[in-house]
Interface confidence: low
């Protein structure tokens, strides 16, 4: 079973509602984990979490809290919460083959469809990790920069697939 | 009784849902008409109707369509609806003392906050309109810059007055 | 604009900025604070919406910096605790227009954190 | 981030002057050119890319869009000589580019 699956929850529904409610030209900054397309998921996810997490709390900051309904601030506010469980369980299984990039994060930004196509790649990693080969390797080939990344912006609708 | 004020719906409870789901830093652009807020409103309001108007629309194609509930689409489309009977009735009743501003509409960048103030007092003019006396200037004083209009943003919190 | 509250300040201490404003509907505008470090270039600070209820940061003061506004005596605020040595700049308050650019700029305070 | 260019530059009155921004992202119109000279506060040239702000001379010209944008200023005067900054202001955080000096040849 996948590391920190069972704190991972079908949030599919709320973030398509989330993307379609928030306007296309809004730019949302992530500091984005070089490579992490392209690379397996143990050798970016440890910090594409925390930096996740950053960026959904600061996008939170940019919303008031009304009671009423499935707002974008309780949208925002569940996958917050989320996401910081997975920091916090990702901390927890540190030694678990979870490894660091050799590149540190570049501040970006991006669409909200490309924002959630990233956060919903990350959420999947949960769900199909498992643990990694010692041998598999965390190097980007240096002929491939982090704006080739193929899939941060598809030319395809947003559709976001089965989280859980 | 208001010039066109069967066209008003009550929307407060709408707008209100709509600025706290949109991001505090997002710009919209209006072609905001110098004095609206030191002229009578029979002075600019048959030209910032067409503003919002184009703006709102434009807000629009910013946002995708979803069925379920109150979304940000729903509501900005019930307001293109709401402004756009008014920019018909203006037409209607553009003999009825609706004046042209001598200045014309600038463009400028304002917070959902600010955008829907200036909404919400372009409402209230059809609510409050009565016809115009023929002495009432429609200048705006030399020494008045458009950027010192006193009631773009104001003090209080974002609260809309009611609407009809 | 004219700030005020500048000076010089040990490293953790803390020192609050002012900014009275004068000639213009103080309450309209958008506000924000922008630093200048010795021999260095522009780097914005803070902003804060017209009403008040509104407060953005950069990410290298955030947690540590406060900005407000009081509409009733026209003057803006920047309330700066545990500074550190990174922190020594020229102080400017400057307002947001309605283009969302800065155009009427204050003429500086300086804050010098050292021990 | 916003990237300028050249960082300085030696130019003699009458000379035409052009200074070049480059926003890492797409930032629509939301570009502004500010002058500051030592000791004294950033002063607005141009704001929305390529609108010229009350006051200033129209020697100064602005232009782009996206990601370029272009200061230009068409004949040099000797009141000119600062450092300019673009800035990109319609998103948070709001960033500077890192300066041009232009100095005296």
């Known amino acids: 079973e996948g590391i920190c699956r069972n704190r991972v929850t079908n949030n599919v529904k709320d973030v398509t509602k989330l993307v379609a409610n928030l306007p296309k030209d809004y730019m949302i900054t992530l500091k984005y984990v070089p490579g992490m397309d392209v690379l397996p998921s143990h050798c970016w996810i440890s910090e594409m979490v925390v930096q996740l997490s950053d960026s959904l709390t600061d996008l939170l900051d940019k919303f008031s809290n009304i009671s009423e309904g499935l707002s974008n601030y309780s949208i925002i506010d569940k996958l917050v919460n989320i996401v910081d469980d997975l920091v916090e369980c990702v901390k927890e299984n540190s030694s678990k083959d979870l490894k660091k990039s050799f590149k540190s994060p570049e501040p970006r930004l991006f669409t909200p469809e490309e924002f959630f196509r990233i956060f919903n790649r990350s959420i999947d990693a949960f769900k199909d990790f498992a643990v990694a080969s010692e041998t598999s390797d965390c190097v980007v080939s240096s002929t491939l920069s982090p704006e080739k990344d193929s899939r941060v912006s598809v030319t395809k609708p947003f559709m976001l697939p089965p989280v859980a | 009784e208001g010039i066109c004020r069967n066209r008003v719906t009550n929307n407060v409870k709408d707008v209100t849902k709509l600025v706290a789901n949109l991001p505090k830093d997002y710009m919209i652009t209006l072609k905001y008409v110098p004095g609206m807020d030191v002229l009578p409103s029979h002075c600019w309001i048959s030209e910032m109707v067409v503003q919002l108007s184009d703006s709102l629309t434009d807000l629009l194609d910013k946002f995708s369509n979803i069925s379920e509930g109150l979304s940000n689409y729903s509501i900005i489309d019930k307001l293109v609806n709401i402004v756009d009977d008014l920019v018909e009735c203006v037409k209607e009743n553009s003999s009825k003392d609706l004046k042209k501003s001598f200045k014309s509409p600038e463009p400028r960048l304002f917070t959902p906050e600010e955008f829907f103030r200036i909404f919400n007092r372009s409402i209230d003019a059809f609510k409050d309109f009565a016809v115009a006396s023929e002495t009432s200037d429609c200048v705006v004083s030399s020494t008045l810059s458009p950027e010192k209009d006193s009631r773009v943003s104001v003090t209080k919190p974002f609260m809309l007055p009611p609407v009809a | 604009l004219v700030e005020s509250g500048g000076g010089l300040v040990q490293p953790g201490g803390s020192l609050r900025l002012s900014c009275a404003a004068s000639?213009?509907?103080?309450?309209?505008?958008?506000m924000s604070w922008v630093r200048q470090a010795p021999g260095k270039g522009l780097e914005w600070v803070s902003a804060i919406s017209g009403s008040g209820g509104s407060t953005y940061y950069a990410d290298s003061v955030k947690g540590r910096f406060t900005i407000s506004r009081d509409n009733s005596k026209n003057t803006l605020y920047l309330q700066m605790n545990s500074l550190r040595a990174e922190d020594t700049a020229v102080y400017y308050c400057?307002?947001?227009?309605?283009?969302?650019?800065?155009?009427?700029w204050g003429q500086g305070t300086l804050v010098t954190v050292s021990s | 981030q916003m990237t300028q260019s050249p960082s300085s530059l030696s130019a003699s009155v009458g000379d035409r002057v052009t200074i070049t921004c480059r926003a890492s992202q797409g930032i629509r119109g939301y570009l502004g050119w500010y002058q500051q000279k030592p000791g004294k506060a950033p002063k607005l040239l141009i704001y929305s890319a390529s609108s010229l702000q009350s006051g200033v001379p129209s020697r100064f010209s602005g232009s782009g869009s996206g990601t370029d944008f272009t200061l230009t200023i068409s004949s040099l005067q000797p009141e000119d000589f600062a450092t300019y900054y673009c800035a990109g202001t319609g998103f948070m955080p709001y960033t500077f580019g890192q300066g041009t000096k232009v100095e005296i040849k």
């Open positions: 000639g213009f509907t103080f309450s309209s505008y958008a």
């Open positions: 400057a307002r947001r227009d309605f283009f969302a650019h800065f155009d009427v």
